[in-house]
């Protein structure tokens, strides 16, 4: 049976998996795959390590910890609803049927929408593609995405709107900048 982990759309998902190397540097191959662990190997491999290195990975999938110390937890960057499903972490211990298998069920929830102050709501309604957030976890940062295609008059109006608004303070406090 699989164990459930949760993340929100746009966040990074963390799927923990560990093993204890028999001795320092005595690593065993590990694979991560989308779908439940089959009898052998991993199906739909997204990341693989061998006795020395991470030798295969796909974009958005990476190991956050030090796999040389047995931390083979998977991070999936900027998840979407399509990332939902079961993932297999397989520790490929030498010998017949010695592998350790972990089936982890990732449940992706829609991003929480928090009510904003009136001024900010007016602003984001006028420029809906401007304000976005990226990142997850302790190092979460807030950034501004690309400005929509607007003319100089609109930018000037926008600057005036921002000057003494609460949003301007929020943006300054968060270290975000307008690009």
């Amino acid at each position: 049976s699989e164990v459930e982990y949760r993340a929100e759309v746009g966040q990074n998902a963390y799927l923990p998996c560990f093993y204890t190397p028999a001795a320092p540097g005595n690593l065993v191959p590990v694979c991560w795959g989308k779908g439940a662990c089959p009898v052998f190997e991993c199906g739909n491999v997204v990341l693989r390590t061998d006795e020395r290195d991470v030798n295969y990975w796909t974009s958005r999938y990476w190991l956050n910890g030090d796999f040389r110390k047995g931390d083979v937890s998977l991070t999936i960057e900027n998840v979407t609803l399509a990332d939902s499903g079961i993932y297999c972490c397989r520790i490929q211990i030498p010998g017949i049927m010695n592998d350790e298998k972990f089936n982890l069920k990732l449940v992706i929830k829609p991003a929480k929408v928090t009510p904003a102050p009136t001024r900010q709501r007016d602003f984001t309604a006028a420029f809906p593609r401007m304000l976005t957030t990226r990142g997850h976890g302790p190092a979460e940062t807030q950034t501004l995405g690309s400005l929509p295609d607007i003319n100089l008059t609109q930018i000037s109006t926008l600057a005036n709107e921002l000057r003494d608004s609460r949003l301007a303070n929020d943006l300054r406090d968060s270290g975000a900048t307008i690009r």
Epitope: V3, F18, P24, G25, G65, D66, K69
Partner: antibody, heavy 117, light 107 residues
Framework: EVQLQQSGAELVKPGASVKLSCTAS????????MHWVKQRTDHGLEWIGR????????KYAPKFQGKATITADTSSNTAYLQLGSLTSEDTAVYYC??????????WGQGTTLTVSS | DIQMNQSPSSLSASLGDTITITCHAS??????LSWYQQKPGNIPKLLIY???NLHTGVPSRFSGSGSVTGFTLTISSLQPEDIATYYC?????????FGGGTKLEIK
């Protein structure tokens, strides 16, 4: 034989800082995560943080962020815990431990820190 | 943070008894749970890792079970040397957290 030898007891004044050491023998600290754990009298165990001596990367419990700094010197096979702005709440036994990778398989003998004027 | 709620906080049992200590995690930690024994005036010692794996040199009367959020440490045929405080610890998420401890006494 794996051993973690910690520095001796410390008596320090409030407001001061202190640096505790943990010297490993029987293994190379670069191959493990090194942790520090706090235990006050009649209290449980509290995880302070850890370091990956291989690259210096650290993780701290939020409670100890700004209070504790963990470092490591791989040439002397030693991990350090520095505690700043000391108060009576910091009076405790501090243990170093290594992890493999998520559990603590070997512990130091502990260093007693007393903060008193 | 993941809270680890351990019960009971203290326990009195007779030699030869079988006792059970439970640990409940506030969220899923799969099997990434360890148990430690700390005898009076001594350092903590690892008993069990990955919820049920016995650490080298630990007597077989100690056993662990459970997964996800519920875990138990069982000591069968209690011995005088088992007088100690026992702690659970989760190692899945930072910050790592310990249970409050269970102090075991002999009747």
């Amino acid at each position: 034989e794996v051993q973690l030898q910690q520095s001796g007891a410390e008596l320090v004044k409030p407001g001061a800082s202190v640096k505790l050491s943990c010297t490993a023998s029987g293994f190379n600290i670069k191959d493990y995560y090194m942790h520090w754990v706090k235990q006050r009298t009649d209290h449980g165990l509290e995880w302070i943080g850890r370091i990956d001596p291989d690259n210096g990367e650290t993780k701290y419990a939020p409670k100890f962020q700004g209070k504790a700094t963990i470092t490591a010197d791989t040439s002397s096979n030693t991990a350090y815990l520095q505690l700043g702005s000391l108060t009576s709440e910091d009076t405790a036994v501090y243990y170093c431990a290594r992890s493999s990778p998520y559990y603590f398989d070997y512990w130091g003998q502990g260093t007693t820190l007393t903060v008193s004027s | 943070d993941i809270q680890m709620n351990q019960s009971p906080s203290s326990l009195s049992a007779s030699l030869g008894d079988t006792i059970t200590i439970t640990c409940h995690a506030s969220q899923n930690i799969n099997v990434w749970l360890s148990w430690y024994q700390q005898k009076p005036g001594n350092i903590p010692k690892l008993l069990i890792y990955k919820a049920s794996n016995l650490h080298t040199g630990v007597p077989s009367r100690f056993s662990g079970s459970g997964s996800v959020t519920g875990f138990t440490l069982t000591i069968s045929s209690l011995q005088p040397e088992d007088i100690a405080t026992y702690y659970c610890q989760q190692g899945q998420n930072f910050p790592y957290t310990f249970g409050g401890g269970t102090k075991l006494e002999i009747k």
